[in-house]
C-alpha cells in the first residue's frame, strides 16, 4: 500500500516500514523488539515485568466426619451445599491462619463417606527471584497444618466438639501446581532472533530483560562517544566522526586527529 | 432462609418445668438437625439438646433424664420440655438449625439462630 504523506522522502514510506512495521498514514508503527523511524532499530531492552504474584494450588482431600452425607451436597446450587462450603471455608481458614501465603480453599467435589471433600488450597506469594522457595516452603506447611488437625478433631462417641471432625486416615495430597515464571526464558523468546545477545539481571529483585546496549548493567557495552547498534551478529559500536576526530576500534575507543591524517600522522589516545 | 423465633422462657422455682418453642420459617423443617443451645453469665454458648432429620439426638449429660427434645413437622415447631429444674439451668436458651445433618456441639457449626429466651430457675 502506498501513501502519500507531507514532508521530504515522505512518499512510499509505508512500503518502507521495516522488521514488520506497519505504516498508520503518519508513521511506522513498530512491533515490540523495533523503534525507530523506519523500525530499523532493535530496542535495548524488554519488558518483562514478572507477574506481581505467583501462585500455586494444592489438590487435597479430607473427610469429614462430623457431617453425615446426604444427596443434595452433590449440588453445588443446593443450601446444603452453601452451608457445608461455609463451615468448610470458615475452618479451613483457622487451620491455615498462620501462613501468610495463604488465600483461601476451593471446594470441587463432595462425595459419599462420611463427607470426601475433594478441594484446592490457594496459595499465593509477591514476586521474588525466591518465589518457588517460598511456595515449596508454605505447601509443607500447609500438609503439616492439614495433617495436624484431622489428627486432633476427630469423633469421640459420634459426637464433634469441633467445628469440624474429621478421618485420620482421609487426608491425602494429590498435586501441587505452581505458576511458573521464568524470566531468563520469557527474555529469550521475546527477544526472537536476537535472543542469544539478550540477558536477564536483577535490580532490587525485579529482572530486567536487556541487550549489551542498554546502560547501566553489568553486561553493558561501552561504545564511549559511539552507538550501540544490536545487530544478528551480536551488539556493535557504530563510531562516531566529530569535526576535530575520527573514532574507530570495538569500543570506538580509538581517536585519529583529523589534521593530523591529513599531515600523514597518526595519533592514538 | 431459615428464620428462627424462640419463646416459653420465664421464672420458675427448683423443681419446677418449663416448655420451651422454636418456631421455624422456610421449608427446611423436616431435613437437617436443629439444636438447643443455652449460655449463662459469664460462660461460653453450650448444646442443650441436638436432633437430626435421620432420627440421632444428643443431651448434654447435665441435663439426661430431666430435658426432651421434638419437634413437630407439620407446625415447623421445636420444641424443649424442661422438667426437674435446677438453679444451674438459669441461662438464655437459643434455638439453632442447619440444613446439613450434624453432628457437632460446637455453635460455629450451626447457620441459623433465633433470638434468646430467657430461664430463670430462682426459689
Known amino acids: 500500500r502506498t501513501t502519500t504523506c507531507f514532508g521530504d522522502g515522505c512518499q512510499n514510506t509505508a512500503s518502507r516500514c521495516k522488521n514488520g512495521g506497519t505504516w498508520d498514514g503518519l508513521k511506522c508503527q513498530c512491533p515490540n523488539l523495533y523503534y525507530g523511524e523506519l523500525c530499523e532499530e532493535v530496542v535495548s531492552s524488554i519488558d518483562i515485568g514478572p507477574p506481581e504474584t505467583i501462585s500455586a494450588q494444592m489438590e487435597l482431600t479430607v473427610t469429614v466426619t462430623s457431617v453425615k452425607f446426604t444427596e443434595e451436597l452433590k449440588n453445588h446450587s443446593s443450601q446444603e451445599f452453601q452451608e457445608f462450603k461455609q463451615t468448610f471455608t470458615e475452618q479451613m481458614n483457622i487451620v491455615y491462619s498462620g501462613i501468610p501465603e495463604y488465600v483461601g480453599v476451593n471446594i470441587t467435589k463432595l462425595r459419599l463417606g462420611s463427607v470426601v471433600v475433594e478441594h484446592d488450597v490457594l496459595l499465593r506469594t509477591k514476586y521474588t527471584p525466591e518465589y518457588k522457595t517460598v511456595l515449596d516452603n508454605a505447601t509443607e506447611v500447609v500438609k503439616e497444618k492439614i495433617t495436624k488437625v484431622t489428627t486432633q478433631q476427630i469423633m469421640i462417641n459420634d459426637i464433634c466438639s469441633d467445628m469440624m471432625c474429621f478421618n485420620t486416615t482421609g487426608t491425602q495430597v494429590q498435586n501441587i501446581t505452581v505458576t511458573q515464571y521464568d524470566p531468563e526464558e520469557d527474555c529469550r523468546k521475546m527477544a526472537k532472533e536476537y535472543g542469544d545477545y539478550f540477558v536477564v539481571e536483577y535490580r532490587d529483585q525485579k529482572p530486567y530483560c536487556i541487550s549489551p546496549c542498554e546502560p547501566g548493567f553489568s553486561v553493558s557495552k561501552n561504545c564511549n562517544l559511539g552507538k550501540c547498534q544490536m545487530s544478528l551478529s551480536g551488539p556493535q559500536c557504530l563510531c562516531v566522526t566529530t569535526e576535530t576526530h575520527w573514532y574507530s576500534g570495538e569500543t570506538c575507543n580509538q581517536g585519529t586527529q583529523k589534521s593530523l591524517v591529513y599531515g600523514h600522522h597518526h595519533h592514538h589516545h | 432462609e431459615v428464620q428462627l423465633q424462640a419463646s416459653g422462657g420465664g421464672v420458675v422455682q427448683p423443681g419446677g418445668s418449663l416448655r420451651l418453642s422454636c418456631a421455624a420459617s422456610g421449608d427446611t423443617f423436616s431435613r437437617g438437625s436443629w439444636g438447643w443451645f443455652r449460655q449463662a453469665p459469664g460462660k461460653e454458648r453450650e448444646a442443650v439438646a441436638l436432633?437430626?432429620?435421620?432420627?440421632?439426638?444428643f443431651y448434654a449429660d447435665s441435663v439426661k433424664g430431666r430435658f426432651t427434645i421434638s419437634q413437630d413437622n407439620s407446625k415447623n415447631t421445636l420444641y424443649l420440655q424442661m422438667n426437674s429444674l435446677r438453679a444451674e439451668d438459669t441461662a438464655v436458651y437459643y434455638c439453632?438449625?442447619?440444613?446439613?445433618?450434624?453432628?457437632?456441639?460446637?455453635?460455629?457449626?450451626?447457620?441459623?439462630w433465633g433470638q434468646g429466651t430467657m430461664v430463670t430457675v430462682s426459689s
Open positions: 439453632a438449625a442447619s440444613v446439613l445433618v450434624l453432628r457437632t456441639l460446637n455453635p460455629k457449626a450451626w447457620h441459623h
Open positions: 436432633i437430626s432429620s435421620d432420627g440421632w439426638t
